[in-house]
Amino acid sequence: MHSDCIFKKEQAMCLEKIQRANELMGFNDSSPGCPGMWDNITCWKPAHVGEMVLVSCPELFRIFNPDQVWETETIGESDFGDSNSLDLSDMGVVSRNCTEDGWSEPFPHYFDACGFDEYESETGDQDYYYLS
């Protein structure tokens, strides 16, 4: 499947997951906490203030680094998976904190968490630049 299609599909699935998670958690627009979001890279479930959300490396990095293997599991398609099985010390895990002011930026940033072979990218496929 073309990378652009993968991302459109991922985004659509993300919005569905967020809607289901909102229902399960009793979240609405006026709820304190952080709304679920698609940050154009990966999907983040809704969270309460003080909660740290962990995700494994998104699909984008399987396009960027096709040979990269992460020890952590990929979060399931039908829900957000069990983030308790992920650990920040693992390669391939990114976190965001939900604070009173909203979401923090990813930690570590995606490249540091998911690996990026800069040399290999020089000769790699160039079709990702118009991904939405």
């Epitope: 940050d39 154009n40 930026e105 630049y129």
Partner: antibody, heavy 120, light 107 residues
Framework: QVQLVESGGGVVQPGRSLRLSCAAS????????MHWVRQAPGKGLEWVAV????????YYARSVKGRFTISRDNSKNTLYLQMNSLRAEDTALFYC?????????????WGQGTLVTVSS | EIVLTQSPATLSLSPGERATLSCRAS??????LHWYQQKPGQAPRLLIK???QSLSGIPARFSGSGSGTDFTLTISSLEPEDFAVYYC?????????FGPGTKVDIK
């Protein structure tokens, strides 16, 4: 090697506009976030804006929000900063920097800067 | 926005001495705190990422520590080329911010 070359600076009157460019080479531009950071004469660094690898995410400092627009053309390996309604306090050396990430990241390589002087 | 405060503003030391620079954040930035060196007429250079992670090409005399709100950059033994301005930068919360800088000059 990573190379970033800024251009477009100059002297401009308050209230007018200017567009800065940053030509990138030595890395796969379309995979990296890019930042603009400025430095007023004799002062410290001030973060201005960042754009994600594909232009889908753009974020700004409060001091420039609504006046400056960051954009990129991945087919030309070029980053832009459109500056409108310029003020005297915008006078600074403007650096473009690569963000080590797809989304935002921290600046890891910097250009040499282009000087913008806002004066009547 | 997160305000970064650096101290001291100026540090006057001699070559061979140890330099200890501080950066304090107005709220927690976790470990998303990075250090830069800037020499007159030059662009900044990334020295340390994520509070304590060293980078290739950066001399081992530069080290960082801290997390949350309090961070330290240490230069174990100052070389003549280390006299410069040092900035901390947080990438934990948008809008990103830099500290005002610490100037390390020759006593």
């Amino acid at each position: 090697q990573v190379q970033l070359v800024e251009s477009g600076g100059g002297v401009v009157q308050p209230g007018r506009s200017l567009r800065l460019s940053c030509a990138a080479s030595g890395f796969t531009f379309s995979r990296f976030a890019m930042h603009w950071v400025r430095q007023a004469p004799g002062k410290g660094l001030e973060w201005v804006a960042v754009i994600s690898y594909n232009g889908g995410n753009k974020y700004y400092a409060r001091s420039v929000k609504g006046r400056f627009t960051i954009s990129r053309d991945n087919s030309k390996n070029t980053l832009y900063l459109q500056m409108n309604s310029l003020r005297a306090e915008d006078t600074a050396l403007f650096y473009c920097a690569r963000g080590y990430d797809v989304l935002t990241g921290y600046p890891d390589y910097w250009g040499q800067g282009t000087l913008v002087t806002v004066s009547s | 926005e997160i305000v970064l405060t650096q101290s001291p503003a100026t540090l006057s030391l001699s070559p061979g001495e140890r330099a200890t620079l501080s950066c304090r954040a107005s709220q927690s930035v976790g470990r998303s705190l990075h250090w830069y060196q800037q020499k007159p007429g030059q662009a900044p250079r990334l020295l340390i990422k994520y509070a304590s992670q060293s980078l290739s090409g950066i001399p081992a005399r530069f080290s960082g520590s801290g997390s949350g709100t309090d961070f330290t950059l240490t230069i174990s033994s100052l070389e003549p080329e280390d006299f410069a301005v040092y900035y901390c930068h947080q990438s934990s919360r948008l809008p990103f911010t830099f500290g005002p800088g610490t100037k390390v000059d020759i006593k």
